[in-house]
């Protein structure tokens, strides 16, 4: 299934998507939509680019903050709410080719949890579970095969998140 990315309410979420312009600088249209990629295009479009720039955003919370001109079309959603949870489609609309590149990613927005820290735990979040934590502006994305690691429940995620944050560790955005 699609890779999950986790963000806390009020934080920024980062959903990775990229392609390699060929030749370099030869950009193609891209759309981001809320909901799995449909048969064509994107449904419930939140952001759309043309061959030069972003030309359609449904809200000022949606941004492409990566190097758009090098094919980094990762979506940043600012100040996420629980309503932002769900599957998003990044569709790279390659002209002259019969098939667009379709990428479905899942955003899970969680409420900030207040958990008593256990400072002895020093463990890399990305090896703890097959979901990616997303807390803002970092990047680039780290790729990981979904389902290749044991799953954990949200309580464990809360605990790991807070323990790492409280111990000063950096939580990488994926």
């Amino acid at each position: 299934s699609e890779v999950e990315y986790i963000a806390e309410v009020g934080q920024n979420a980062y959903l990775p998507c990229s392609y390699t312009p060929a030749p370099p600088g030869n950009l193609v249209p891209v759309c981001w939509g809320k909901g799995a990629c449909p048969v064509f295009d994107c449904s419930n479009v939140v952001l759309r680019t043309d061959n030069r720039d972003v030309n359609d955003r449904t809200s000022g919370r949606y941004w492409l903050k990566g190097d758009f001109h090098k094919g980094d079309v990762s979506l940043t959603i600012e100040n996420v709410t629980l309503a932002d949870s769900g599957v998003y489609c990044c569709r790279i609309q390659i002209p002259g080719i019969m098939n667009d590149e379709k990428h479905n990613v899942k955003l899970v927005v969680i409420k900030p949890a207040k958990v008593t820290p256990a400072p002895t735990l020093q463990r890399d979040l990305t090896s703890a579970f097959p979901r990616m934590l997303t807390t803002g502006e970092h990047g680039p994305a780290e790729t990981q095969t979904p389902g290749s690691l044991p799953d954990v429940n949200l309580t464990q995620i809360f605990t790991l998140t807070n323990e790492l944050r409280d111990s000063g560790a950096t939580i990488r955005t994926a």
Partner: antibody
């Protein structure tokens, strides 16, 4: 809600050209993608192709040399033309649209026979 | 083209019972699968998209699952109006291709 209605002849002779019309209400054919799909007597469904909001087309390679999909935005209609038909083209033809092929016409049944 | 192998081609089940239909794609279609119900004289009706998402207005008796090359479709608590032919569709790659269909009858 989008509604589609197919129209055209019910009988065509082999080697002739088939022309079908899809009349669309509830949406403009200057947006989205507009498809043709057919169902053969043995129940097999085949995707034939589309015309989209900009007038770009895609045709199933199995039909490429014989098929043409066009549109008339002023009439809000799009069309299927299939050349050099044979008895193998006997089928029910559907016009279809929607994010996941949500909207289908009722279909028009075509028999190719001499 | 991506061939979709659907089975069984027909099945018969009791009212209130459960049926399962499967589709196997020749290659990974990344969950880009829809399921349709077709009754004579009508256009096919979308039931499920993206493998498991129920289309608006479709009863929760219908469900789908799968990933990679293997997909399945279930109807629980069969009702008389479920008599129809059911198809899977892969929309991952053009040309989009349908399964061969499963004709459902009620005993």
């Amino acid at each position: 809600e989008v509604q589609l209605q197919e129209s055209g002849p019910s009988l065509v002779k082999p080697s002739q050209t088939l022309s079908l019309t899809c009349s669309v209400t509830g949406d403009s054919i200057a947006s989205a993608y507009w498809n043709w799909i057919r169902k053969f007597p043995g129940n097999k469904l085949e995707y034939m192709g589309y015309i989209n909001y900009s007038g770009s087309t895609y045709y199933n390679p199995s039909l490429k040399s014989r098929i043409s999909i066009t549109r008339d935005t002023s009439q809000n209609q799009y069309y299927l033309q299939l050349n050099s038909v044979t008895t193998e083209d006997t089928a029910t033809y559907y016009c279809v649209t929607g994010d996941y092929f949500d909207y289908w016409g009722r279909g028009t049944t075509l028999t190719v026979s001499s | 083209d991506i061939q979709m192998t659907q089975s069984p081609s027909s099945l018969s089940a009791y009212l209130g019972g459960k049926v399962t239909i499967t589709c196997k794609a020749r290659q990974d279609v990344r969950k880009n699968i829809g399921w349709y119900q077709h009754k004579p004289g009508k256009g096919p009706r979308l039931l499920i998209w993206y493998t498991s998402t129920l289309q608006s207005g479709i009863p929760s008796r219908f469900s789908g699952s799968g990933s990679g090359r293997d997909y399945s479709f279930n109807i629980n608590n069969l009702e008389p109006e479920d008599i129809a032919t059911y198809y899977c569709l892969q929309y991952d790659n053009l040309p989009f291709t349908f399964g061969t269909g499963t004709k459902l009858e009620i005993r």
